[in-house]
Structure formats: C-alpha cells, structure tokens
C-alpha cells in the first residue's frame, strides 16, 4: 500500500492489500477502499468502464466478466488499483473480436485471461494451420496478445488465443485480422486519351483510372487555372486485396469553345501525389 509523507494527500488504501486477487467463479468479491476523501470505484475491462460511488465494492456471485481492474479514486484525484481475476474453467478468455491492424504497426488481440495461472498463453492459427513464420507477439494476461509489426500478408488471418489448462490446449473464439495497408508509393493514374478535338455542342467525356492499395486514395478532376468544381462520376472495384481501381469520368454534355483547355486528374495518398492531363480543344 502507498506511503506518503505527512501533510501531503495520499492515495486511497484498498483491502485486500495486494495488486492482484484471484477468486473462483460464484464466490464473493469484496473490496474496501479506505480514504476520508473517497469519491468512487471504477471497474475496467476490455477498455469499458463502470462506476460505483460506495466505498465497498461487493459482487455477491462473481462471474468471469467481473475480471478486470478495480480503481479507487479520492477527491485529490489520487488512485489505487487492484486487478481481480475471476477463475472460471468454462470461460478462460474475455474477448472483443474486432481486430484491425495497420500495416507495420502493432495491434492488440483482445483476449484477456480470467485465470493468470494457466500456461502457454499464445496465438494459434485456425483449423490447425500454423501462424505465419514471421508473426511475433507479446502476451499480457490483463490485456490480450499484441501482434508486433503487422504485415500485409496477415490480412484475413484467422487465429485463436490459446492457453494450456491441465495439460490440454484451450482455444478462444476465432479472430479475423483485417489489415489496412500503408501507402508505400504514389497512386498510379492514367487517362483514356491525351487530347480531344471536338466541335461545339458535342459531348466531351474522359475517364481517369486511379490504382492504389486501398479506397482511401483521394482523386479529383481539376481544370487548370480554375477553381470550378467539375461534375464527375465514379466506378470502383477491388481486384482482390490491396488492388483497388477507381474510374473517375468527367463529362461535359455539350462542349463550348470556352471549355477548351487542360484538364488534370489528380490523386493523392499519404505517401504522395500523382497527376495526368488531357487537352480539350473545341472548335465552332
């Protein structure tokens, strides 16, 4: 428990006075917060919170979902915490199966344990398939398992959190990893035709094709030396993972001489930008 020099505000005191507590499912959780300026208890698991304004937190029949961090806070904003594991052989993991990873970043598989004394807490592939050889992870019983430096190749990888309990492997529900690619090159842009010669009244239509790893790529048609918003229509396709194509079609239904000029298809992503132009000449 915390000790502070007299006169300074001190953090609350929690009974039982330990950082971690293990209780069996069905047993009572009884936590006492002692502080003259007690404000509240906060319970947190899977980043969700509940509050209790009584200084004694009592759960008569503990369930696995009562596993988590219990924090007592006083009026000075000082706090103290205890982590409670509710051991339930039928529910070894608490899970949130939403799993997204940004390429080259770490991502957390949220499967905290309800029993810290199980062994070999790790990740396993679904249907007995091995995990990718280069997949590295760090387990944390209170948070889950952190996958280090997500690769594009892990997209739609199916995995389970796994522990050994009494000599047997126990798996969590399935997680499907969805990887968001990092932009590592500028978009590829091309135009259906580099120049057009039209008579007044004819329709001008030109298509720009933008290719990139995801639909997050930005694109627009611009008229050079003009701020006027051009009317464009889009079609887009995913040709498998990380192969996105967009067609942006610019149309002027009845071209006029003063529509003549250079039109630019511009695209950018977080890596950089690219553009391509087409020239329209309208004669009367």
């Amino acid at each position: 428990q915390p000790s502070v020099s007299p006169g300074e505000p001190s953090p609350p005191s929690i009974h039982p006075g330990k950082s971690d507590l293990i209780v069996r499912v069905g047993d009572e959780i009884r936590l006492l917060c002692t502080d003259p300026g007690f404000v509240k208890w906060t319970f947190e698991i899977l980043d969700e919170m509940n509050e209790n304004k009584q200084n004694e937190w009592i759960t008569e029949k503990a369930e696995a979902t009562n596993t988590g961090k219990y924090t007592c806070t006083n009026k000075h904003g000082l706090s103290n915490s205890i982590y409670v594991f509710v051991r339930d052989p039928a529910k070894l993991f608490l899970v949130d199966r939403s799993l997204y990873g940004k390429e080259d970043n770490d991502t957390l598989v949220r499967c905290p344990l309800t029993d810290p004394e199980v062994t070999n807490y790790s990740l396993k592939g679904c249907q007995g398939k091995p995990l990718p050889k280069d997949l590295r992870f760090i387990p944390d019983p209170k948070a889950g398992i952190m996958i280090k430096s997500v690769k594009r190749a892990y997209h739609r990888l199916c995995l389970h959190c796994s522990v050994d309990q009494e000599g047997k492997s126990v798996l969590s529900e399935k997680f499907i990893l969805k990887v968001r690619p990092a932009f590592k090159a500028v978009p590829v842009v091309s135009v259906s035709k580099a120049s057009y010669l039209l008579r007044e009244g004819e329709e001008f239509t030109v298509t720009c094709t933008i290719k990139d790893v995801s639909s997050s790529v930005y694109s627009t048609w611009k008229r050079e030396n003009s701020q006027t918003k051009l009317q464009e229509k889009y079609n887009s396709w995913h040709h498998g993972d990380f192969n996105y194509e967009r067609q942006a079609t610019l149309t002027i239904s009845s071209a006029r001489v003063n529509d003549s000029g250079v039109f630019m298809c511009y695209a950018n992503n977080t890596f950089g930008s690219a553009n391509v132009t087409t020239t329209l000449e309208v004669v009367d």
């Epitope: 947190e44 980043d47 199966r97 939403s98 399935k174 499907i176 968001r180």
Partner: antibody, heavy 117, light 111 residues
Framework: QVQLQQPGAELVKPGASVKMSCKAS????????MHWVKQTPGQGLEWIGV????????SYNQKFKGKATLTADKSSSTAYMQINSLTSEDSAVYYC??????????WGQGTLVTVSA | NIVLTQSPASLAVSLGLRATISCRAS??????????MHWYQQKPGQPPKLLIY???NLESGVPARFSGSGSRTDFTLTIDPVEADDAATYYC?????????FGGGTKLEIK
Amino acid sequence: QVQLQQPGAELVKPGASVKMSCKASGYTFTSYNMHWVKQTPGQGLEWIGVIYSGNGDTSYNQKFKGKATLTADKSSSTAYMQINSLTSEDSAVYYCARERDTRFGNWGQGTLVTVSA
Amino acid sequence: NIVLTQSPASLAVSLGLRATISCRASESVDIYGNSFMHWYQQKPGQPPKLLIYLASNLESGVPARFSGSGSRTDFTLTIDPVEADDAATYYCQQNNEDPYTFGGGTKLEIK
C-alpha cells in the same frame, strides 16, 4: 454505461457545411472504432465511414468520399463528422455507432440535419 | 459492394405467432465460418438497436424470442412468439467487406 451523445438537430443553408459531434463516455475512447451512418426515408440506412481507434485513420464509403470528413478529439473523447456543400439530399438523421466485438453495439440518438434556405 | 436484399418489405403477424424475416447477400459474408451478419431493430424516433450478432448470437439483454440463423448468403431473423412491443422495422447489416451495407428494412406490424 457506455453513452454516445449527439446534438438533436442542425438547421443549415444549402451550400454551407455542418460539423456534428458525438461525445463518448463509459469506455476508453481511443480503443474502439467509431462509425457513422446516414438514415433517410428514401435510402434507408447507409454506412458513411469509420474512424479507427488509436491512430485516427479513416475509411469511407465511396459514395461519401469528399462529402464527409471524419475526425476525433482524443482529449474530449469526441468524434466529429463534417459534411460540406450541403444540398437537400443531405437532409437526414446521422448516427454515430461504436464498434464492439465485430458489431455496432452502441448508437448515439442521432442528429437530424435539415438543409433549407 | 455487397447488396443485402430483405424480404418481405412489410409483414403483419398476429400476436403470439411467429415472424420470419429473410436477408439475402449478393455474395458470401463468411470468413472461416464466421458470418459477419447482424440484425437490428428500430422504432420511430430511436436509433437502431442490436438484436443478433454474427448471424446467430443473441445480444445481451435481448429476449430469447429473437433468434438468427443462416450462413454465407442466406440469413433469417425469427421472432417467436411475437409480442406487441416487437412492432418496428428490422434491418440486416454486413461488415465482412467495405463498404458495410444494410438491408432495405422489413416493417413488422402486429395484428
């Protein structure tokens, strides 16, 4: 105890833009993805896009790309959606929804946007 | 884009009987046996409320009268028995693939 608070209504003029808020409480804001959904009587429910937890990356429905912009302020646990160049077709109820365990487990009450001169 | 087609568009069911709503996807919403299909209930002036997630899992606090089934492209929401409070519009939604999409809705009326 998870709550998503949205303003009830916004009245805006055609051509203007509107920035609506979604204030989150009861969970760690930076740990969950926030989605936005548009509802009109004619088009039903349409997914606009998502702002991902942690780094603020976004992904949009192509239909709303350039029309909507999603941002978040971690310090106030608030997600925002800005809609620009408003027309009558943008009149709708806009919801924020938190993704939890693969589904939209919590929704705001919605903001009714009316575009009128 | 994955298109979700709900049928029927509207449905009138007598109190105490069974209501069945169908949702068909234009392509599979399954990955490794997980169906990324969810069902929501919406009443006028309220946001959608989650009923069923991952095709067949009952959301906490939702009565067991609601059940979901199906896989790949064909999914069903069943309410049995129907109660007066179930009058609402029901939507299916997939989040297997961007952009996430919703069905057009089924309006349930209680006779």
